[in-house]
């Protein structure tokens, strides 16, 4: 025997209290598939989060971050501050590259300049903290 | 026991207003997201508007935007939904609703009245 439920569209959910009749999500909630027997709560973009995407009855809100912030992991569930290019974030904040490093965006960890000499090359162009060195012939 | 009384509503013709009233009990409104649904002929249940979170935040359905206003009586515990520029589209059967938050997170709403009939024509 069919699921009454399985008629139910992304939107709604199937309410027990209405004989499994398909109701209307209410504000604030969607259901992104058909079934569903409750709807789900809307993502709040708050604080340092800002909504890149408004919450409708079958999709949720989409967050991006506040400038000065970026995304970090599955669907932006944190923002981290941003740094200066040739600097890296740590638990104090904002620190230049270590001499022998460097980090060309404003996201990320400092890394180590490349060593020209293990591909028998010489150095074109001096690394900086912003950006790695050039090697040449 | 949660219980939701309707009234309020009536015929009127196009263009008229009406006021319509949720008196609730069981549980205390300003608590609560609270809200109405309507019922056309012949067709599903559609949000028509709610006062959401603690903070009195309010949604309405593009169709009513600018012509209908929810508010609510705290001291009384009772629901409003004021009417405005009525239009033969909003003849429906309006039921007071309460959001049901669930312990998993899942989001339902309660519709306990019998509703009241809201008729727009001339």
């Known amino acids: 025997l069919q699921d009454p439920c399985s008629n139910c569209p992304a939107g709604t959910f199937c309410d027990n209290n209405r004989n499994q009749i398909c109701s209307p999500c209410p504000p604030n909630s969607f259901s992104s598939a058909g079934g569903q027997r409750t709807c789900d709560i809307c993502r709040q973009c708050k604080g340092v989060f800002r909504t890149r995407k408004e919450c409708s009855s079958t999709s949720n809100a989409e967050c991006d971050c506040t400038p000065g912030f970026h995304c970090l992991g599955a669907g932006c569930s944190m923002c981290e501050q941003d740094c200066k290019q040739g600097q890296e974030l740590t638990k104090k904040g904002c620190k230049d590259c270590c001499f022998g490093t460097f980090n060309d965006q404003k996201r990320g960890i400092c890394r180590p300049w490349t060593n020209c000499s293990l591909d028998g090359k010489s150095v074109l162009v001096n690394g900086t903290k912003e950006r790695d060195v050039v090697c040449g012939p | 026991e949660v219980q939701l009384l309707e009234s309020g509503g009536g015929l009127v013709q196009p263009g008229g207003s009406l006021r319509l009233s949720c008196a609730a009990s069981g549980f205390t409104i300003s608590a609560e997201d609270v809200g109405w649904v309507r019922q056309a002929p012949g067709k599903g249940l559609e949000w028509v508007s709610a006062i959401l979170d603690f903070g009195g935040s309010t949604y309405y359905a593009e169709s009513v935007k600018g012509r209908f206003t929810i508010s609510r009586d705290n001291a009384k515990n009772t629901l409003y939904l004021q009417m405005s520029s009525l239009r033969a589209e909003d003849t429906a059967v309006y039921y007071c609703?309460?959001?049901?938050?669930?312990?998993?997170?899942?989001?339902?709403?309660?519709?306990r009245g019998q509703g009241t009939q809201v008729t727009v024509s001339s």
């Open positions: 609703a309460r959001v049901v938050y669930h312990a998993g997170g899942g989001v339902t709403f309660d519709t």
